[in-house]
Amino acid sequence: TLNSVLNSNAIKNLPPPLGGAAGHPGSAVSAAPGILYPGGNKYQTIDNYQPYPCAEDEECGTDEYCASPTRGGDAGVQICLACRKRRKRCMRHAMCCPGNYCKNGICVSSDQNHFRGEIEETITESFGNDHSTLDGYSRRTTLSSKMYHTKGQEGSVCLRSSDCASGLCCARHFWSKICKPVLKEGQVCTKHRRKGSHGLEIFQRCYCGEGLSCRIQKDHHQASNSSRLHTCQRH
């Protein structure tokens, strides 16, 4: 049950204040466990995570992943859970804490040599052993040798957004994930209406930058639901 996962809510340390809002005005919800203490303006974190409902890992913090809180639990409810440390069981990369990745069901260190080989292996399996190109992109992608010494630049292979330099996010590109620019004001963005709809994208866009939210472009309000164009707009 949820209570067994979240059995303690003691208020502890003070992380830095939140930089800005996400989503769009009037949207009713997001998920995560640090908080503004009533009457104060400092964020405080909570032991064992205050439940934060989510649909995908990107909605949680860098040290969290999105999943059902109980094994075989209510499939309709997922929350942000603390990432898994080295040698813990995992099912996907995002479950492992930054600096680690999921290999054979276990979180292992992202030692660059091993990690490069694993990424190549994964991508090669995804495309088959044919090394031809798709739309000019090489099917075999390797990591920059400085991947974990310096933050990934645009086009670098990544596992999560924290692997990328400032102003970039980790987004799908074919069957890999690379660092792409966070969207600027006026750029087209993707508004996901269904849980799990990210899974349909092989060219995933980043989210809108700070102070922006993904909203229907004013002159597209009359268009049919399916053709509505969303752009990054100021709150």
Epitope: G34, G61, V182
Partner: nanobody, 123 residues
Framework: EVQLVESGGGLVQPGGSLRLSCAAS????????MGWFRQAPGKEREFVAA???????LYADSVKGRFTISADNSKNTAYLQMNSLKPEDTAVYYC?????????????????WGQGTLVTVSS
């Protein structure tokens, strides 16, 4: 600055009902999740319920089947309908608005909080 103002608290008899409201404002207000938490005298604050922008809801085991969370996006308002109240539901109830932390490089998703409204269940 996000402002969350709770209302609807008060004294109610066991078995009774109350509906709490949380009005969110602020020039930059936006949230992916709205939630309710509570803190009884001498106890730690605990999670009660939350709702995502897509409508998914989440409840603490202790309130499942008795409390219902909802939101009116057009009014930036969240509600908590509390039925079959028990004395152990007595607490200050806090509204919370949440945004994921990853896009800002934060390690954990976060909530902003209101000042709270007192709910007393007693005969």
């Amino acid at each position: 600055e996000v402002q969350l103002v709770e209302s609807g608290g008060g004294l109610v008899q066991p078995g009774g009902s109350l509906r709490l409201s949380c009005a969110a404002s602020g020039r930059r207000f936006s949230a992916d999740v709205m939630g309710w938490f509570r803190q009884a005298p001498g106890k730690e604050r605990e999670f009660v319920a939350a709702i995502r922008s897509g409508g998914t809801t989440l409840y603490a085991d202790s309130v499942k089947g008795r409390f219902t969370i909802s939101a009116d996006n057009s009014k930036n308002t969240a509600y908590l309908q509390m039925n079959s109240l028990k004395p152990e539901d007595t607490a200050v109830y806090y509204c919370a608005a949440g945004n994921g932390g990853r896009q800002y490089g934060h390690s954990r998703a976060r909530y902003d909080w209101g000042q709270g409204t007192l709910v007393t269940v007693s005969s």
